[in-house]
């Protein structure tokens, strides 16, 4: 009992004056609280409380459920307690079978005893199964049995509180331990697609998948630089214990251009946070943008190959593609394919393969592509480089020697005189007249050049060389001269 110090308020005194009292079931419990400032008795078991304003607590026929702590409190807030055990051989445990444990924390199996004199108060596995080897516990007859540092592996563990009474083991009702996992890593988040491109009015829907050990993970879709709450729908699954998956789907039923932006799926738990983003671009209508992969003006040597390559962005998907030359559509020699197999790909490649080009195959090659919203085209001007060809070489009536050559690029014609029968001509002769003949003709064909010299300048036997050349190559034609007296005579020209 408390000792009284004069002048200071003292706790109440309880009769019987002991800390613990054992009564048999059916017997009377009579507890007297003596204090001039008595306020109330409080009875507490399994963390539930009852109050009594009488200073004498009387229970005529004690039951096991009357086991518990009886506390008397005075007006100064001072109190004194006695713990009463109501010994009932048929009910050795009072129980609350709700049993939840947080991983790495302690949890109390609430099975206080009604008889403190039983022995070997402990936990046992159900159906004779042993407890996990690492399970440690501390028994307290007035509260229950504390399991220390709950492990994830204990989830759905079936337990009994157990005592030995008169040499026999007695078990309580079953307890099923439900373990709430501790978060030991950030959530794992992923998004159905990293970017979306839509036309105005189309539906935008994106799904974020959040994986964690329990459904307590928090997740939300956020618009970057905005506080507006977005409407989401959820689906969730428990794939066995501690393997939880949530799908958070964000939908904008009719997207507008100003909905474009970055959307973030954010998830956090007590360990930390993770996020993933997706980009939405909404356009008012579809588009096609073509990017030539080579120069649109192409020079290629006669007989060689060339690939005309374009990349293009098309949204929505391209519906028709064609390559055209001289109003004719290619049915083969070209291929069209997506730049990537990615579902969100809008970039495509088209290649026209031109093989062994002839000088007559220069011209405009056009790629046309269309989708449901727009058409687009790009033209390639193909020039076929050809070695000059001497079309004509003649002595004209007026005594001029004329050479006409065709090729691309435009040939240059030089004249040389070779004395005697030598065909190694070095002395150059300036032409009298040079004309490009077909500048008004088709722009991609061979260019024809005509050059003339005055043959009266030659006073000796010899050979005149007409040499046509360009970047690709050269070709020569020859005029042979022989003088008989004062007469000059043209002997056959030859190449």
């Amino acid at each position: 009992q408390p000792s009284v110090s004069p002048g200071e308020p003292s706790p109440p005194s309880i009769h019987p004056g002991k800390s613990d009292l054992i009564v048999r079931v059916g017997d009377e419990i009579r507890l007297l609280c003596t204090d001039p400032g008595f306020v109330k008795w409080t009875f507490e078991i399994l963390d539930e409380t009852n109050e009594n304003k009488q200073n004498e607590w009387i229970t005529e026929k004690a039951e096991a459920t009357n086991t518990g702590k009886y506390t008397c409190t005075n007006k100064h807030g001072l109190s004194n307690s006695i713990y009463v055990f109501v010994r009932d051989p048929a009910k050795l445990f009072l129980v609350d079978r709700s049993l939840y444990g947080k991983e790495d924390n302690d949890t109390l199996v609430r099975c206080p005893l009604t008889d403190p004199e039983v022995t070997n108060y402990s936990l046992k596995g159900c159906q004779g199964k042993p407890l996990p080897k690492d399970l440690r516990f501390i028994p307290d007859p007035k509260a229950g049995i504390m399991i220390k540092s709950v492990k994830r592996a204990y989830h759905r563990l079936c337990l009994h509180c157990s005592v030995d009474q008169e040499g026999k083991s007695v078990l309580s009702e079953k307890f099923i331990l439900k373990v709430r996992p501790a978060f030991k890593a950030v959530p794992v988040v992923s998004v159905s697609k990293a970017s979306y491109l839509l036309r105005e009015g189309e539906e935008f829907t994106v799904t974020c998948t959040i994986k964690d050990v329990s459904s307590s993970v928090y997740s939300t879709w956020k618009r970057e630089n905005s506080q507006t709450k977005l409407q989401e729908k959820y689906n969730s699954w428990h794939h066995g214990d501690f393997n939880y998956e949530r799908q958070a789907t964000l939908t904008i039923s009719s997207a507008r251009v100003n909905d474009s932006g970055v959307f973030m799926c954010y998830a956090n738990n007590t360990f930390g946070s993770a996020n993933v983003t997706t980009t939405l671009e909404v356009v008012d209508k579809g588009f096609i943008n073509i990017f030539p992969m080579i120069n649109t003006t192409v020079f290629v040597n006669d007989g060689e190959n060339v690939d005309l390559i374009v990349e293009y962005e098309a949204f929505p998907k391209p519906e028709h593609q064609q390559w055209i030359y001289m109003n004719r559509t290619f049915t083969d020699k070209w291929e069209d394919y997506p730049k990537s197999e990615n579902e969100s790909n809008i970039r495509y490649v088209s290649e026209l393969h031109l093989t062994r080009l002839k000088g007559t195959e220069g011209g405009t090659y056009t790629f046309l592509v269309s989708n449901s919203d727009v058409n687009a085209a790009i033209a390639f001007n193909v020039y076929v480089n050809t070695k000059p060809e001497i079309l004509t070489y003649d002595r004209l009536v007026n005594g001029m020697l004329q050479c006409v050559a065709a090729g691309f690029p435009e040939p240059t014609i030089d004249w040389y005189f070779c004395p005697g029968t030598e065909q190694r001509c070095s002395a150059s002769v300036l032409p009298v007249d040079v004309q490009t003949l077909n500048s008004s003709g088709p722009p991609f064909g061979k260019l024809v050049v005509q050059s003339s010299i005055d043959s009266s300048a030659f006073k000796h036997n010899g050979t005149v060389e007409c040499k046509a050349y360009n970047d690709v190559g050269k070709t020569s034609a020859y005029f042979n001269f022989a003088f008989k007296g004062n007469n000059k005579e043209q002997i056959h020209p030859h190449t």
Epitope: E48, T49, D96, N105, C126, I176, R180
Partner: antibody, heavy 117, light 111 residues
């Protein structure tokens, strides 16, 4: 004797939030899990979530994920349920319920929340 | 989520007659033979009241005309002799797995 006393009826506009309280007595507040259940007019019961005894961990019905927050004030033995972004279909009676020996042994009297523009 | 399906939706029984309500879970609510299944009674304007816990245990203060049975996925609430004060809606509930779920309710009336 255990008692759960809830706060009074509320009328809210769509988009607003509501916070319902549940004051507990007759037991050690921190020793028991507190659940929240709602019931729309003429409908059945729907579990919303729980705040666990001891450390205040929570678990929510995914239907309300991101909108519901359950908290507790140990000093006043009061549990709270806040529901945000209210819509008309959130009009319901909201109950707190104490879990005892695996079942919902004690219920609050209910709080009617009406969501109307 | 475990789906709880109650049948029938409503039931009209004469006073003194037996009323039987069934509840089926979409998956077992048992652990080690313990059924985490409870029955509640709700009268208009009142909160639910616990009748039966862990499938077959009668809550303190509930008349013994109420009884519960079943395990695994199939459960039954029986009122052996219907009284006027038993007119109410009855709900089953599982708390084996989060989220805890309720049946849709069965309305019991007097024929």
């Amino acid at each position: 004797q255990v008692q759960l006393v809830q706060s009074g009826a509320e009328v809210k506009k769509p988009g607003a939030s509501v916070k319902v309280s549940c004051k507990a007595s007759g037991y050690t507040f921190t020793s028991y899990n507190m659940h929240w259940v709602r019931q729309a007019p003429g409908q059945g019961l729907e579990w919303m979530g729980v705040i666990y005894s001891g450390n205040g961990d929570t678990s929510y019905n995914q239907k309300f994920q991101g909108r519901v927050t359950i908290t507790a004030d140990k000093s006043t033995s009061t549990a709270y349920m806040e529901l945000s972004s209210l819509r008309s279909e959130d009009t319901a009676v909201y109950y707190c319920a104490r879990e005892r020996d695996t079942r919902f042994g004690n219920w609050g009297q209910g709080t009617l929340v009406t969501v109307s523009s | 989520d475990i789906v709880m399906t109650q049948s029938p939706d409503s039931l009209a029984v004469s006073l003194g007659e037996r009323a039987t309500i069934n509840c089926r879970a979409s998956e077992s609510v048992d652990i080690y033979g313990q059924s985490f299944m409870h029955w509640y009674q709700q009268k208009p304007g009142q909160p639910p009241k616990l009748l039966i816990y862990l499938a077959s245990n009668l809550e303190s203060g509930v008349p013994d005309r109420f009884s519960g049975s079943g395990s695994g996925t199939d459960f039954t609430l029986t009122i052996s002799s219907l009284q006027a004060e038993d007119v109410a809606v009855y709900y089953c509930q599982q708390n084996n797995e989060d989220p805890y779920t309720f049946g849709g309710g069965t309305k019991v009336e007097i024929k």
